[in-house]
């Protein structure tokens, strides 16, 4: 039950995180005009990964896309790439994790396969979250560098007569959305990995001990509550689970069914 809850919660948290990463990537407010200690402009500038916008105090907003690819800063391209990779990995992770959910039954999918898929999606979520956090952090670093550079020459003038308003940019809402979303995706991924450990039957550190009686043989399975007799098809076909624990001899007998990559 705890495993199902952990897996389900991990999925929901990751889903919210990936939705946030998508939202952050699409948002226009990655950097916004710094209003502190600046002249009160009747124009508010803000920029995203895909376009820059200007909102006039009249309420009119105009956005222009970055229609060039080669003319854009390499850092911006890198941030775009990181965010897209994060989204793609997260989307694949979500798809995989849907099938991995313990509460969803798909044909005769074994718990071992579900454990595999849970681990895979968990890793994907972790990488997705890291990509988003890295992308947002790279952009934030770029902003901080540019901010102090523009502060150094806040007013550039021609012989001190004509002043030009230097537009400084600070952190936009998208950065905070990205950081939070990346963190949630990361947490969701970790939860999926934890859930995977609970789903996967674990190997014990000792071999099963068989006691041979004169009439019939009984194999005592130290890991489980049940003991199966040596005759019939019972031993061959029945998998004995005890909270994910399994016996050594099962692994050796059926490598094709119970091997974990």
């Amino acid at each position: 039950m705890a495993v199902t809850a952990c897996q389900g919660l991990g999925f929901v948290v990751s889903l919210i995180g990936i939705a946030g990463i998508i939202a952050a990537t699409c948002m226009d407010q990655w950097s916004t005009q710094d209003l502190y200690n600046n002249p009160v402009t009747a124009v508010f500038n803000y920029q995203g990964l895909w376009r820059s916008c200007v909102r006039e105090s009249s309420g009119f907003t105009e956005c222009r896309g970055y229609f060039t690819l080669l003319g854009l800063p390499a850092m911006l391209q890198a941030v775009r790439a990181l965010m897209i990779v994060g989204i793609v990995l997260g989307a694949i992770g979500l798809l995989v994790s849907i099938f991995a959910l313990k509460c969803i039954r798909i044909g005769s999918m074994e718990d071992s396969a579900k454990a595999n898929m849970t681990l895979t999606s968990g890793i994907m979520f972790i990488v997705s979250g890291l990509c988003a956090i890295a992308g947002v952090s790279v952009f934030a670093n770029m902003l901080v560098t540019n901010f102090w550079m523009s502060t150094a020459n806040m007013y550039t003038g021609m012989g001190g007569m004509v002043q030009t308003v230097q537009t400084r940019y600070t952190f936009g809402a998208a950065l905070f959305v990205g950081w939070v979303a990346g963190g949630l995706t990361l947490i969701g991924g970790v939860m999926m990995c934890i859930a995977c450990r609970g789903l996967a039957p674990e190997e014990t550190n000792y071999k099963a001990v068989s006691y041979h009686a004169s009439g019939h043989s009984v194999a005592y399975k130290p890991g489980g509550f049940k003991a199966s007799t040596g005759f019939g098809s019972n031993t061959k076909n029945k998998k004995i689970y005890d909270g994910g624990a399994r016996t050594e001899d099962e692994v050796q007998s059926y490598p094709s069914k119970h091997d974990y990559v």
Partner: antibody
Amino acid sequence: QVQLVESGGGLVKPGGSLRLSCAASGFAFSSSAMSWIRQAPGKGLEWVATMTVGYIYTYYLDSVKGRFTISRDNAKNSLYLQMNSLRAEDTAVYYCARQGYGNAMDYWGQGTLVTVSS
Amino acid sequence: DIVMTQSPLSLPVTPGEPASISCRSSQSLLNSGNQKNYLTWYLQKPGQSPQLLIYWASTRESGVPDRFSGSGSGTDFTLKISRVEAEDVGVYYCQNNYIYPLTFGQGTKLEIK
């Protein structure tokens, strides 16, 4: 068509108060920034105050800050200018205007005269 | 505050002749975000309210005759009337629409000779 009609002007003693109103019609008032501009007799235009869309920001001329208050009632399609502690130099025709592209005042009212005299 | 300086303050013109009014701002009105100049031109005809002619320094307001044109960038701007007509008389104002307070120029009075 767009119409802006100012009212509330008149003669007032120095230190007195007056409330100007501007009734708007013919456009989406709630999604438009509105301004008050004044013109002293025989003088040029002087911007007084602006209220942006959604009550977010209000801006004032330094000499009227703390004395004048711009407000709006979107339900009534009306803009207001509450003027307190009036001075002789506040005597002017007060225009109500809508801000359009480029923050330009694209539509103006006919104006209302405010006279501050003892 | 941005100071807007217009010249000349008075402009007598013969009908059919061109006219030019200059406006200079103490700070640049160019916004780096959209590369637009936040300068506006108005005409106030005698006994009337002002009317918008040009915004963004060079964009003509709808309904404004094409004999009116605006140019300039940064701090220096010009309003040109290709052929002055009798109905063009009045006071022309330039306005800073970039930084609050939204200051106006002193005005240029255009009159027919």
